[in-house]
């Protein structure tokens, strides 16, 4: 926890943030909570970003005040106004950009005192992979596709049966730049697969880890997928 120091006779209050990741082109949330105050009009929330002159967002006297908002955040931010009274100062951020990455500060003033906490916001692209039987291949193969990743991830195949196996020799992975010239489509093909075995396609960069599982039997195909954001920690 990071505690703001008391100023002018006021006590310090506890402010808690959660390091998080934003998926570029999507909408994100920068998490921040604080000790609640019973009077909304006494609460001031300021979001600041290191290296940015203007404010990211300001909420005071029960409403937004965007007079000093930096141009890069114009029309892109909102707090959950109805939840401020219960100590939620989290910020909604529209259309996350790569340039939104950095260190943010959630600064709170209430009638109880002042406090702030920093938050590291990482930005990139991540998506859930879809694994299918590759009907184009000459031998029995699996195709793992994920539409949006950045930075370039690593792709590893694994098998439930042969857990220590290295499939790099029997797989081929390609990265295709998407039209917006930032994110990439990930395609990986695994050759010579065995029926009645569960295979996992694992895609990972420094922001997220995603897994697509597939099990092909004589009668059915079972799929499962999972996405996990990395390094989410409280401050």
């Amino acid at each position: 926890f990071i505690i703001g120091f008391g100023i002018s006779g006021r006590h310090s209050i506890t402010v808690t943030t959660l390091t998080s990741a934003g998926n570029i082109g999507e909408d994100g949330i920068l998490s921040c909570t604080f000790e609640p105050d019973i009077k909304l009009s006494d609460i001031v929330i300021q979001w600041l970003k290191e290296g940015v002159t203007g404010l990211v967002h300001e909420f005071k006297k029960g409403k937004d005040d965007l007079s000093d908002q930096d141009e890069m955040f114009r029309g892109r931010t909102a707090v959950f106004a109805d939840q401020v009274i219960v100590g939620n100062a989290s910020l909604r951020l529209k259309n996350v950009q790569l340039t939104d990455a950095g260190t943010y500060k959630c600064y709170i003033i209430t009638s109880k005192g002042k406090g702030n906490a920093k938050l590291e916001y990482k930005t990139g692209a991540f998506s859930i992979p879809e694994v299918n039987v590759d009907s184009n291949a000459s031998s029995e193969s699996l195709r793992c596709e994920a539409p949006r990743w950045f930075p370039q991830p690593t792709v590893v195949w694994a098998s439930q049966v042969d857990q220590g196996a290295n499939f790099s020799e029997v797989s081929n992975t390609s990265f295709e730049l998407n039209p917006e010239n930032v994110t990439m489509k990930v395609v990986s093909v695994l050759y010579n697969v065995t029926i009645n075995t569960t295979y996992s396609c694992m895609i990972e960069n420094d922001i997220a880890k995603a897994t697509g599982d597939i099990r092909v039997t004589d009668s059915e195909i079972k799929r499962q997928s999972h996405l996990q954001l990395l390094n989410s920690k409280a401050s």
């Epitope: 909408d27 409403k63 007079s67 909102a78």
Partner: antibody
Framework: QLQLQESGPGLVKPSETLSLTCTVS??????????WGWIRQPPGKGLEWIGN???????YYNPSLRSRVTISVDTSKNQFSLKLSSVTAADTAVYYC????????????WGQGTLVTVSS | EIVMTQSPATLSVSPGERATLSCRAS??????LAWYQQKPGQAPRLLIY???TRATGIPARFSGSGSGTEFTLTISSLQSEDFAVYYC?????????FGGGTKVEIK
Amino acid sequence: QLQLQESGPGLVKPSETLSLTCTVSGGSIKSGSYYWGWIRQPPGKGLEWIGNIYYSGSTYYNPSLRSRVTISVDTSKNQFSLKLSSVTAADTAVYYCAREGSYPNQFDPWGQGTLVTVSS
Amino acid sequence: EIVMTQSPATLSVSPGERATLSCRASQSVSSNLAWYQQKPGQAPRLLIYGASTRATGIPARFSGSGSGTEFTLTISSLQSEDFAVYYCQQYHSFPFTFGGGTKVEIK
């Protein structure tokens, strides 16, 4: 209930400057969670966003019109204004003013609109 | 800029029937989309924002769905006052842009 009302000349000569004012009633233009925007609609066509302004005076314009557009605000009169310079017949349209959410950025409510014809 | 494409251009529906209007974005706009209704000689009226949230005072027969690039406005049972032109608008990135509109007319 918040209401917006556009006013200004209905006829402007080519190459001159179109000037419109939007008067806000039933609420303050200083309301912090909103921008104040202009949208236009040529006869029988679709809608085009022109730009917006915050009560503090900061503006954002549609790049296609940026070189010709100025939006200003007068908080003492609860008004904001649009100026569009060097007009041509292509600028003939119904011009609407509207309140624009700071985020989400939907337009609500709208003024009833005023037709501006560019003709000599 | 993001191009918004609406289809069909005209939709002929009988009163009481369901109307389904489509809006497609040239790139993902997440859920940052609004729908408006415009009647002849009137200003547009906000129906839906956030792709699926009904604006204040809008009847429950209007519903919005979709995210990313594909969106739908559904009018479950058309009333006489619903015959109008409907526009979608993205506010995901500047400049905000509108679709070309769908005219819902009486069949």
